[in-house]
Interface confidence: low
């Protein structure tokens, strides 16, 4: 039987009455159109809802939008369209919400054809008030906030100008023309590419990369022959055209572009691409596309400088540039990532790593599931997860995998059990240990969300018919209760809960359709009375993360240390609360070969922890570029995994000899850089 239907499931007492008292309906006085929702700040309860409706007339499209605000997590909404002078807001720019708890919001308005510039509405008090500002340019992109200072905004204009504001959009200054792409770096630095000969597209591969650290007072050219650039963690990457042909290579800088090193990654041709899959303080996951239209490539993981890379995973599924990849950071457990590979027979399989890309394995088969028709052996198969690629292929998958940093160990995803991903209707699976073990949680596709740091999981069946039932679980998906939140079913469009999974409120969005009209409606359910009391010490239990063999002294050691967490007992029905902080106790582990990656020119054969030399590089000097000099690498094949904290134990030595020769292939050497001031 499906989980939740077993007789041992304890019922939450009087939950219907408790939830009925805490269910708040809001009908929006609106034609249906489209709706977008944004949370403003963390733990503020402020939600902005923008509804837009397009009426196609014979000559033009007439647009109307309305803006609503809630300050109680969506229980009540107030129409505040008058605060923006009943202006039509451009949905393609969305609502630009300021970083952290700045309380800042920017809305971009639709303006008439002949106007000199665009128009924005700005709020710095969590959308209580808005100031209308006419822009001296027409924006091409959404306003981008500096992560360090929410008063600093940048935007690109339709004429490719780079515009900056230092006073939260009150006054704007064009700091550069002919700009293709601009991004905030750290410390209010702006990086951007410029073209010289007409357009971004025409100059692709001949762009210049610039930096300003003072919001446009002075500039430094930090790269030439640029195809594109990206930021990840503390790394700045540039894809640079080679001198002689149409290939390009990745260069990396860790000092904001002052010095560059060539990344030890394969070069790519015109039809190929690089993609930063994930980056943190320590390292980078980089995808390098295979030649030809294969739909796959290779994942490489970097060292702590972003220069030397190890092959992490072959045949990694990633369709064309800007296309789909299933690569997912499991945020509920350190070091865990899930993605898909395209096997030789063109089937798609899910792989998981628990040690930040050091080793990938299939997902263990859930104990309460049978292998499906894709399995050759009915007793041996794996769980395969549906993510972005399945969604793009219009499979019956309403949601990508879900994990939350404060719901330790919990991962929820749609999947199928077999030798590969199945096109059959998927079920929903849950892991409570960061992906090591899985259980079928719900039959068929569902929308799901995590509340109260994992204390409650809420789900709604994915159906083409109107719905009026929500399911919830207080024991990490083992048992489920159903609650009818309205007599009149609605066409469901989405579940919304405050980012961060600390809230106990869930909003169910949808629309009602009658003979004459259709209207947006939301139901916000507060689960606070289901979890009646605050959790106490006795409600938590100690859990060792990454534990696979409790007898082993090194059990739980990943990246050089183990972590014990205090986790809520499944049987405890109580509130973690908004201020819940994950309690963890780390301890250092002794070093083993697992704490080292294979160095450049080495690889790890399957099921072996030793690094062996790549046959094609045997006997060759391993040379690579570092800060514009050629280096000679003497290595025994190992280097410590970035972020690994192990001490003692095995210690394979690694040394680099400086040959003090210039790198002929490093196009970004410092002497080619120049500066200028405005």
């Amino acid at each position: 039987s499906a989980p939740g239907e077993d007789e041992e499931c304890g019922r939450v007492r009087d939950f219907v009455a408790k939830l009925a008292n805490n269910t708040h309906q809001h009908v929006f006085d609106d034609l249906r159109g489209s709706v977008s929702l944004s949370w403003v700040g963390d733990s503020t309860g402020v939600i902005l809802v923008l509804t837009t409706f397009h009426v196609p007339l014979v000559i033009m499209t007439f647009g109307q939008s309305k803006l609503y605000r809630s300050e109680d997590y969506g229980k009540n909404f107030k129409d505040i369209t008058d605060l923006i002078n009943n202006t039509f807001i451009r949905t393609e720019f969305g609502m630009a919400i300021g970083p952290e708890n700045s309380g800042k919001v920017v809305l971009t308005a639709e303006v008439s054809g002949g106007s000199r510039g665009g128009r924005i509405f700005r709020s710095s008090d969590f959308a209580k008030n808005f100031v209308q500002t006419d822009l001296p340019f027409h924006p091409l992109t959404q306003m981008m906030y500096s992560p360090q200072n929410s008063d600093y905004l940048l935007a690109l204009s339709t004429e490719n100008g780079l515009w900056v504001s230092k006073n939260f959009g009150g006054k704007w200054e064009e700091i550069h023309k002919a700009v293709c792409l601009a991004k905030w770096g750290s410390d209010n630095t702006i990086f951007f590419t410029t073209y010289a000969n007409g357009s971004c597209k025409a100059d692709l591969g001949a762009l210049e990369l610039w930096r300003t650290s003072d919001l446009g007072k002075s500039f430094k050219t930090i790269g030439v022959k640029i195809y594109s650039f990206g930021l990840g963690g503390r790394f700045l990457f540039a894809s640079v055209m080679a001198d002689k042909d149409t290939t390009r290579r990745i260069h990396v800088s860790t000092d904001q572009g002052d010095t560059w090193s060539m990344a030890q990654l394969p070069s790519v041709g015109q039809e190929q691409f690089y993609s930063i899959l994930a980056a943190n303080d320590d390292m980078v996951f980089m995808h390098v596309d295979e030649p030809g239209d294969t739909g796959f490539g290779t994942i490489f993981t970097s060292d702590d400088r972003g220069i030397v890379y190890s092959k992490s995973l072959d045949r990694h599924l990633y369709t064309t540039t800007g296309g789909e990849t299933d690569f997912t950071n499991v945020t509920s457990l350190r070091g865990v990532y899930i993605t898909s590979v395209l096997s030789e027979d063109n089937s798609i399989q899910t792989m998981i790593t628990f040690d930040q890309g050091g080793r990938w394995t299939h997902l263990r088969k859930p104990e309460n599931s049978e292998c499906d028709a894709t399995a050759k052996n009915k007793n041996e198969c794996s769980l395969h997860i549906h993510a972005s690629y399945s969604i793009s292929q219009k499979l019956n998958v309403p949601m990508a995998p879900l994990s939350e940093p404060n719901a330790v160990g919990i991962v929820i995803a749609h999947g199928s059990v077999g030798d590969a991903i199945s096109v059959m209707v998927p079920d929903v699976y849950i892991s409570d240990d960061g992906g090591y073990s899985w259980t079928k949680m719900l039959e068929g596709p569902h929308y799901y969300t995590i509340l109260d740091s994992g204390g409650i999981i809420v789900a709604i069946e994915h159906s083409s018919r109107p719905i009026n039932v929500i399911k919830f679980s207080t024991d990490e998906g083992q048992c489920w209760q159903t609650y009818t939140f309205t007599r009149d079913p609605i066409y469901f469009t989405g579940l919304a809960s405050e980012p961060g999974a600390r809230s106990m409120n869930i909003s169910i969005w949808g629309f009602t359709e009658s003979f004459l009209t259709s209207q947006w409606v939301s139901y916000t359910i507060d689960f606070k009375d289901i979890l009646e009391r605050n959790c106490e010490e006795k409600d938590y239990t100690i859990w060792l993360a990454h534990s696979t063999d409790p007898e082993d002294y090194e059990d739980g050691c990943i990246l050089g240390y183990k972590e014990q967490f205090l986790r809520l007992r499944k049987s405890s029905v109580c509130q973690n609360g908004r201020d819940y902080v994950v309690t963890k106790q780390p301890s250092i582990c002794l070093c083993s070969l697992e704490d080292f990656l294979c160095d450049f020119g080495y690889y790890r054969p399957e099921n072996d922890s030793k690094c062996v030399e790549q046959p094609e590089l045997k006997g060759h000097d391993l040379e690579f570029c570092l800060y514009g000099r050629e280096e000679h690498l003497t290595t025994n094949g190992y280097r410590k995994i970035p972020g690994d904290k192990c001490q003692g134990g095995v210690n394979p030595v690694r040394e680099v000899k400086d040959l003090k020769k210039k790198c002929t292939s490093n196009f970004l050497s410092p002497e080619k850089q120049n500066s200028k001031s405005n």
Partner: antibody
Framework: EVQLVESGGGLVQPGGSLRLSCAAS????????MSWVRQAPDKRLEWVAI????????YYSDTVKGRFTISRDNSKNSLYLQMNSLKAEDTAVYYC???????????WGQGTLVTVSS | DIQMTQSPSSVSASVGDRVTITCHAS??????IGWLQQKPGKAFKGLIY???NLKDGVPSRFSGSGSGADFTLTISSLQPEDFADYFC?????????FGQGTKVEKR
């Protein structure tokens, strides 16, 4: 017991250098961001710099940017502040402070006095 | 930079009194404010974080309120050990800034 102990303060001439240390104990140092904060003789507090738990990110107040460098050695449970080109207005008691997951100043040391005078 | 204006600069009170200290931020900082206590010769002690949250081990007579730009620290019934200097600090954005401090002294 969670403890932070600053050292390295003293009398130095304008333009001189000094290196402050902060020894941490009683908690897992490598999982916390750390700050330096100073208190001038008039009792006013000024945040000086912060460093992330892994040491990769640092931020400085404008008054010390380019002159002071914050660093840490997680293996020694130690935080440092290298102060160059010292000025009279840098005279203060310097405190190191721990940044917990809650907020940025949850545990403090006793402070070390730095006097810049000719 | 965000200015934190703390008032009063000093307050004379007796044991059992209710003491209120306020901090005004020059711009909205939501709840990104903490309150600190400093006693002569002792290390600073964190009292309140995120505007209203009491740090573990801090007596419940201390409370914080406010959001946006105006914040208050209240000592509901002053105890002998509460005579000290109190500071607010904002950590909404860099550079972090402190109030000028309030001295709570014996009347």
């Amino acid at each position: 017991e969670v403890q932070l102990v600053e050292s390295g303060g003293g009398l130095v001439q304008p333009g001189g250098s000094l290196r402050l240390s902060c020894a941490a104990s009683g908690f897992t140092f490598s999982t916390y961001g750390m700050s330096w904060v100073r208190q001038a003789p008039d009792k006013r507090l000024e945040w000086v710099a912060i460093i992330s738990s892994g040491g990769s990110y640092t931020y400085y107040s404008d008054t010390v940017k380019g002159r002071f460098t914050i660093s840490r050695d997680n293996s020694k449970n130690s935080l440092y502040l290298q102060m160059n080109s010292l000025k009279a207005e840098d005279t203060a008691v310097y405190y190191c402070s721990r940044s917990s997951s809650h907020w940025y100043f949850d545990v403090w040391g006793q402070g070390t006095l730095v006097t810049v005078s000719s | 930079d965000i200015q934190m204006t703390q008032s009063p600069s000093s307050v004379s009170a007796s044991v059992g009194d209710r003491v209120t200290i306020t901090c005004h931020a020059s711009q909205g900082i939501s709840s990104n404010i903490g309150w600190l206590q400093q006693k002569p010769g002792k290390a600073f002690k964190g009292l309140i974080y995120h505007g209203t949250n009491l740090k573990d081990g801090v007596p419940s007579r201390f409370s914080g309120s406010g959001s946006g730009a105006d914040f208050t620290l209240t000592i509901s019934s002053l105890q002998p050990e509460d005579f000290a200097d109190y500071f607010c600090v904002q950590y909404a954005q860099f550079p972090y800034t402190f109030g000028q401090g309030t001295k709570v002294e014996k009347r």
